[in-house]
Interface confidence: medium
């Protein structure tokens, strides 16, 4: 059976697969997924290994029409470095010389300057090029190699291993060499995989059942450290509770060097955030941190300085802390918009069982704003999801130059933010450089400001506008309002009408359904339309909703189903990557973000059309 990293190299023109007959003969044969000799896998960014021989594809020289055969894998050799060129060409790195079928006289696979059909290769059984099953570095734990990546294949007691092994061990722990020759270099580490006893790599907090892994002997960049945690179904550490910080202070007290945690300001337009999307509500900075120096976007915990936090350049090499298990956040269920009949008094706007109102004109200090909201039967608004924030931005009449009090504050416990309405903090969205909590002036209250409505801490004594929120009064079944210019069941936003397609459909089926309604799969033109759509679908239980974006027509170039330019994107992390397909919006914790899915997957969808009676604005000129 093929493991997920292995593949057969397939030439569509001949309908045959590459077959390593021997180290000196790499030919083709009828494709057979059970044949070890036809299985290959990437073992570094640029090396392809034969699974049967544990040797790498290479050439004797970078010249036209030389045989491609198998060599002992050597990560430094220029003659074993391959790269995917446009579409399905595979070439020797840095040259216009391609992996080629050979010809009638030449049975062996050859290196050739021609880029025709005989130089085009796919993963057998897919339409993908060979790089779509690329190499993922595996960062080691413990051992003596400072967390370096596994080197596959590696030699141990004169035997080659292409995977982690428990050879030499009686306890079943899986390890790998971090250079190709363990026997000579003696460098190794344990693999970030599940094996008997791997739980002892973690410390479980008995109070919360959350587990932590302290990798103090590693030396990785922030991004490498994060990858290592993710390889163990974990994330870099987030700290949202004082108890959690206390536990970790104890756990790291014998150490001296800094350890990466998940806090970062890597998002271009927002502020400090945890990589696991926990809310940034508890602050434990070292005095003088966070420093505003550009590039210092990642955060380390300093065991030698009472486990306080310091921002550093992300390329520094440090140890790190991973976290897995129950999140420390209280479980707090936000009702889906469709679950709650929402009836609001005049001038209040309904959303998901609550009513909202912006007070823009009567500026008040935070304490007085809170009093006013409470007199009206509510509180300063709490915000628990990206959908709720996007509802406020897109539908409450929020303006880009607004600066409005919300209920978040750290008045009660310094550096520990809470909502004034007592609901748990499950979500934060800080502006770039925030929360700054400048020491020379108390910034204990929080405002929403700027075009995106992100947050900043502020001195509570500033007179500003504010947003109130209250529980709605349920008044029997809700009357479905027909919005002006839209048919029944469609929702209006600006010039358009939108409808959720409730039948699970492939991308093509969804597109057809929209067309049948004289509409099309939704396009998303800007941040504000995205905000509306996020609030429209984000709290629903289904995982995905199709948009009209795909790269069906031209692989690698994403286009809308209607002739409209792609001027805005909202990709989820690691998207779109190299995956071809169709684009759907996520719900839940990644609400609104775009993922590339296989077009024949089934999902719900959003249709869109011009509202009736709306004058079409002129198309923007480029």
């Amino acid at each position: 059976l093929l493991d997920t990293r292995q593949f057969l190299i397939y030439n569509e023109d001949h309908k045959r697969c590459v077959d390593a007959v021997s180290p000196s003969a790499v030919q083709t044969a009828a494709c057979n997924q059970d044949a070890e000799s036809q299985k290959f896998r990437w073992v570094s960014e640029s090396q392809i290994m034969s699974v049967a021989f544990k040797l790498c594809l290479g050439v004797p020289s970078k010249t036209d029409w030389v045989a491609i055969t198998l060599y002992a894998c050597d990560s430094k050799s220029e003659f074993q470095k391959w790269e995917c060129k446009n579409d399905t060409l595979l070439g020797i790195k840095g040259e216009d010389l391609f992996f080629n079928y050979g010809n009638r006289q030449e049975k062996n696979i050859m290196l050739y300057k021609g880029s025709g059909l005989w130089s085009r290769w796919k993963i057998y059984g897919t339409t993908d090029n060979l790089c779509s099953r690329g190499y993922e570095a595996m960062y080691t734990l413990l051992g003596n190699a400072n967390g370096a990546t596994c080197a596959f294949p590696f030699k141990f007691e004169n035997k080659w291993y292409a995977d982690c092994t428990s050879a030499g061990r009686s306890d079943g722990w899986l390890w790998c060499g971090t250079t190709t020759d363990y026997d000579t270099d003696k460098l190794f580490g344990y693999c970030p995989l599940k094996f008997e006893g791997s739980e002892s790599l973690w410390n479980k907090d008995p109070l919360t059942s959350v587990s932590y892994q302290i990798n103090s002997k590693s030396a990785l960049t922030w991004h490498q450290a994060r990858k290592s945690c993710q390889q163990q179904n974990a994330e870099l550490l987030s700290i949202t509770e004082i108890h959690e910080q206390t536990y970790l202070t104890g756990l790291t007290s014998s150490l001296t060097s800094g350890l990466w945690i998940g806090l970062n300001s890597l998002s271009f337009n927002s502020g400090w955030q945890w990589s696991d999307r926990s809310p940034f509500r508890y602050l434990n900075w070292l005095p003088g941190s966070p420093s505003a120096e550009p590039g210092k976007s990642c955060v380390s915990l300093n065991p030698g300085k009472n486990a306080k936090w310091e921002n550093l350049e992300c390329v520094q090499k440090l140890g790190y802390i991973c976290k897995k298990g129950n999140t420390t956040l209280n479980s707090f269920v936000i009702p889906s918009e469709s679950d709650v009949p929402t009836h609001c008094p005049s001038q209040w706007w309904p959303y998901a069982g609550h009513c909202y109102k912006i007070h823009r004109d009567e500026k008040k200090i935070q304490r007085d704003a809170l009093t006013t909201c409470r007199k009206e039967g509510g509180d300063l608004t709490s915000i628990h999801t990206i959908e709720e924030l996007d509802f406020i931005i897109s539908q409450l009449g929020y303006e880009p130059n607004d600066e409005l009090w919300i209920g978040l504050n750290d008045i009660k416990i310094q550096m520990y933010f809470e909502w004034s309405d007592g609901t748990p903090v499950t979500f934060t969205k800080w502006l770039r450089g925030e929360p700054s909590h400048e020491n020379n002036r108390q910034e204990d209250c929080v405002v929403m400001k700027g075009k995106d409505g992100y947050w900043a801490d502020r001195g509570c004594e500033w007179p500003l506008g504010y947003i109130c929120k209250m529980k709605s009064r349920s008044q029997g079944p809700e009357i479905v309002e027909v919005e002006k210019g839209c048919r029944k069941g469609w929702k209006k936003h600006h010039f358009y009408c939108y409808m959720i397609g409730h039948t699970l459909s492939t991308f093509a089926e969804a597109n057809q359904t929209c067309n049948n309604e004289n509409a099309y799969l939704t396009t998303i033109e800007d941040r504000y339309e995205q905000a509306f759509l996020t609030s429209f679908v984000g709290l629903r239980p289904e995982k995905y909703f199709w948009t009209g974006l795909s790269d069906i027509q031209t692989k690698g170039t994403f286009q809308w189903t209607i002739e409209e330019e792609v001027r805005f994107t909202h990709w989820n992390s690691d998207m779109p990557g190299r995956k071809p397909g169709c684009v759907a919006m996520r719900t839940g914790i990644a609400g609104g973000l775009w993922d590339v899915l296989k077009c024949d997957e089934k999902a719900k969808f959003v249709c869109k059309h011009w509202a009736e009676g709306v004058t079409h604005p002129p198309k923007p000129t480029t």
Partner: nanobody, 118 residues
């Protein structure tokens, strides 16, 4: 490296008790688990009991309910309390440490002889 020294063996009557000790020195912070094994004359070495760094224990069926393995982290020592001894418990008892600092996990002591005879 890890060095292991066993003590506490000797001659005991059937039904009697003995307590074996195994003291570890060297890179002891790297020990993941410790165990006791025994080898009777002309037989294969077999596992008797083991204890992990987290305190989980495991026993061979033949000694369950009679033998108890424990550890004293402060003294870097593992013990085997042997009660209700039988003649078939006669063997050389070896201490083993499983370490994580090299791929070669097992370090052994020299062994201590236990003889159960009337």
């Amino acid at each position: 490296d890890v060095q292991l020294v066993e003590s506490g063996g000797g001659l005991v009557q059937p039904g009697g008790s003995l307590r074996l000790s195994c003291a570890a020195s060297g890179s002891i912070f790297t020990i993941n688990a410790m165990g006791w094994y025994r080898q009777a004359p002309g037989k294969q070495r077999e596992e008797v009991a083991a204890i992990t760094s987290g305190g989980s224990t495991n026993y061979a069926d033949s000694v369950k309910g009679r033998f108890t393995i424990s550890r004293d982290n402060a003294k870097n020592t593992v013990y085997l309390q042997m009660n209700s001894l039988k003649p078939e418990d006669t063997a050389v008892y070896y201490c083993k440490a499983v370490v994580v600092t090299t791929p070669y996990s097992d370090y052994w002591g020299q062994g201590t002889l236990v003889t159960v005879s009337s």
